[in-house]
């Protein structure tokens, strides 16, 4: 025979074809062998011009030989070489599918690989590719979009060889709150790391606000609206600054009275105050907290104390906010001016968390009277809020 070729090569099959001998022959003897593969020999009819090779090993170079027989006579042998395809990984599956994450798992191919190419694509055409190592059989997808159909494909790699792709289709779960109105809704969406988040006042996507969410204290879900920690930010600011907010949300900052009013107008909120000083900690929680609008000069409502810091905020309940340039307190003197801060002063304060950092002069520093008195400026303070019914929402989410 002559013109031996192979066609239709896959990872486990190939088709051998040849030109028949000019003379009539009784049969053809076909043999094939690969590295670490024992030789297989088959005899086929003399009028056959092709033979399907099966049960081949993937990614293996085979040597194929064929000669003709007529009676006791044998023709010369012709040879061809071919390499089987790399076989595909198997059983690609998406598990642990959440709103923004999913876990892809697969079984490796029989052939050894140098890696895998993962491709995942959303219905909107966003495609991402990632190459993972040869010993990997799972990969966590992150930053997915909620309520979105995805097609995930995987291909094994071995040097220049690439297997066929296999695929799976999955859909991320929808966010409970597509436009979270506070950190509790962000948390119920599955975000459990403290840091910067965008919330949407009243769930309106046009009313976006960047906030720092405390996702760890007492179950998390808190919007932090004040932080004192190092004295780098100046808190002796005017009315306009306190209305709008100032500072770095990751560091020392004040979120702003307008924002506090809008947030607390969304429903019933609770207040938490966390204090730290030289290794000591204390907290206060008030189960009713709200801040009025600018017409009320951001009047404070704070009720229902529990905690370890002592009930120092009760004294300020019902008071309007005061700054050095807008004196709304009940003192003859200007409390903000006297104590170099701003607060819902009365005459003047039991709480002065916006006072002068590190100033231990009487009533001038960062004070919480019922914890450290007025002659000790507290090193770390945070004020934060979340819905009063957060525990109920959390339970409902867990059951869901």
């Amino acid at each position: 025979p002559s013109g031996l070729v192979t066609a239709n090569i896959t990872d486990s099959e190939a088709l051998a074809r040849w030109q028949p001998a000019i003379a009539t022959v009784d049969s053809y003897v076909i043999s094939y062998t690969g590295e670490k593969v024992p030789e297989i020999t088959r005899t086929v009819s003399g009028n056959t011009v092709e033979y399907a090779l099966t049960d081949l090993e993937p990614a293996t170079e085979y040597t194929l030989r064929i000669f003709a027989e007529k009676g006791p006579q044998k023709s010369s042998t012709i040879t061809a070489k071919f390499t089987t395809d790399l076989d595909s990984p198997r059983d690609l599956t998406a598990t642990e599918v959440q709103s923004e994450t999913a876990l892809l798992t697969w079984r490796p191919p029989r052939a050894s690989v140098t890696g895998y190419l993962l491709v995942y694509e959303s219905v909107d055409g966003t495609v991402k590719e990632v190459i993972v190592g040869p010993d990997t059989t799972s990969y966590s997808l992150a930053d997915l979009s909620p309520s979105t159909h995805y097609t995930a494909k995987i291909q094994a790699l071995n040097g220049p060889l690439r297997s066929n792709m296999i695929q799976t289709i999955f859909t991320t779960i929808g966010l409970l709150y597509p436009f979270p109105k506070d950190c509790s809704q962000a948390m119920l969406n599955g975000d459990t790391t403290s840091g910067l988040y965008t919330i949407y006042l009243n769930g309106d996507k046009a009313e976006a606000l960047e906030v720092f969410c405390d996702m760890t204290s007492d179950g998390g879900g808190w919007i932090v609206f004040l932080r004192r920690k190092n004295g780098r930010e100046n808190f002796y600011q005017n009315w306009k600054a306190y209305a709008a907010g100032f500072g770095d949300r990751r560091e020392e900052f004040w979120l702003g009275l307008d924002n506090l009013n809008k947030i607390t107008a969304q429903g019933q909120y609770e207040l938490r105050v966390d204090l730290r000083d030289h290794g000591e900690t204390a907290f206060a929680v008030y189960d009713k907290f709200s801040v009025g609008d600018a017409k009320t000069r951001y009047k404070l409502k704070v009720e229902g104390y529990s905690g370890t810091a002592g009930d120092s905020m009760a004294y300020h309940n019902g008071r309007s906010f005061s700054t050095f340039d807008k004196d709304t307190d009940s003192a003859i003197t200007n409390c903000a001016l006297s104590y170099k801060g701003a607060f819902w002063y009365r005459n003047c304060h039991r709480v002065n968390l916006m006072g002068r950092y590190g100033d231990n002069n009487h009533s001038q520093g960062v004070n919480w009277f019922h914890w450290k008195g007025h002659e000790h400026s507290i090193q770390f303070a945070e004020m934060k809020l979340r819905p009063s019914n957060f525990r109920n929402l959390e339970g409902r989410r867990k059951r869901a």
Partner: antibody, heavy 120, light 107 residues
């Protein structure tokens, strides 16, 4: 209208006990801290004890600490002062008073008082 | 404990007089100072809270001032019903303490 009415005073021997009560009306009782203030005959005012709106925090003057116990029943709008181991110097007119806003604050409403006389 | 010292302990005045009573705290108390009026056989009545705030229903002839440690109660024009004993009280910290009282009687 807002009102506080004390009761339970009387003549008692030294070492004995007495329980004073104060009935409140006209305001949301559990929103406010309440106090007992006493006035010995012909003398000035002396703060005795206080209790937060929830009843979770209590406060005492050193002169009565360990002998007197303040409590409240918000369901009954009532304040109490349990006085044990009474002494002659506890003889006074005992007033119940409402705190203006926070636990330590001005006393904006006062009862008419109940007289406690400790004598053998 | 914070000591509250009132002066004078008593004074005689006539109707129409301007009367001033002072109260000194033994330590700094911001504006946590209240004034009461007590008439014989009656319970005390709150006049001024937070050093300078007039309690509802109290006549405007009464005023309070001061901050820190030194405080003043002023009756701008003494009326017959104002003859009574006046007490200052600090509500800065527990135990809340009263001054010894100032008796205002008719000259």
């Amino acid at each position: 209208q807002v009102q506080l009415v004390e009761s339970g005073g009387g003549l008692v021997q030294p070492g004995r006990s007495l329980r004073l009560s104060c009935a409140a009306s006209g305001f949301t009782f559990d929103d406010y801290a309440m106090h007992w203030v006493r006035q010995a005959p012909g003398k000035g005012l002396e703060w005795v004890s206080g209790i937060s709106g929830s009843g979770g925090s209590t406060y005492y003057a050193d002169s009565v600490k360990g002998r007197f116990t303040i409590s409240r029943d918000n369901a009954k709008n009532s304040l109490y002062l349990q006085m044990n181991s009474l002494r002659a110097e506890d003889t006074a007119l005992y007033y119940c008073a409402k705190s203006y806003q926070s636990d330590e604050d001005a006393f904006d409403i006062w009862g008419q008082g109940t007289m406690v006389t400790v004598s053998s | 404990d914070i000591q509250m010292t009132q002066s004078p302990s008593s004074l005689s005045a006539s109707v129409g007089d301007r009367v001033t009573i002072t109260c000194r705290a033994s330590q700094y108390i911001q504006g946590f100072l209240n004034w009461y009026q007590q008439k014989p056989g009656k319970a005390p009545k709150l006049l001024i809270y937070d050093a300078s705030n007039l309690e509802t229903g109290v006549p405007s002839r009464f005023s309070g001032s001061g901050s820190g440690t030194d405080f003043t109660l002023t009756i701008s024009s003494l009326q017959p019903e104002d003859f009574a004993t006046y007490y200052c009280q600090q509500s800065y910290s527990t135990p809340q303490t009263f001054g010894q009282g100032t008796k205002v009687d008719i000259k």
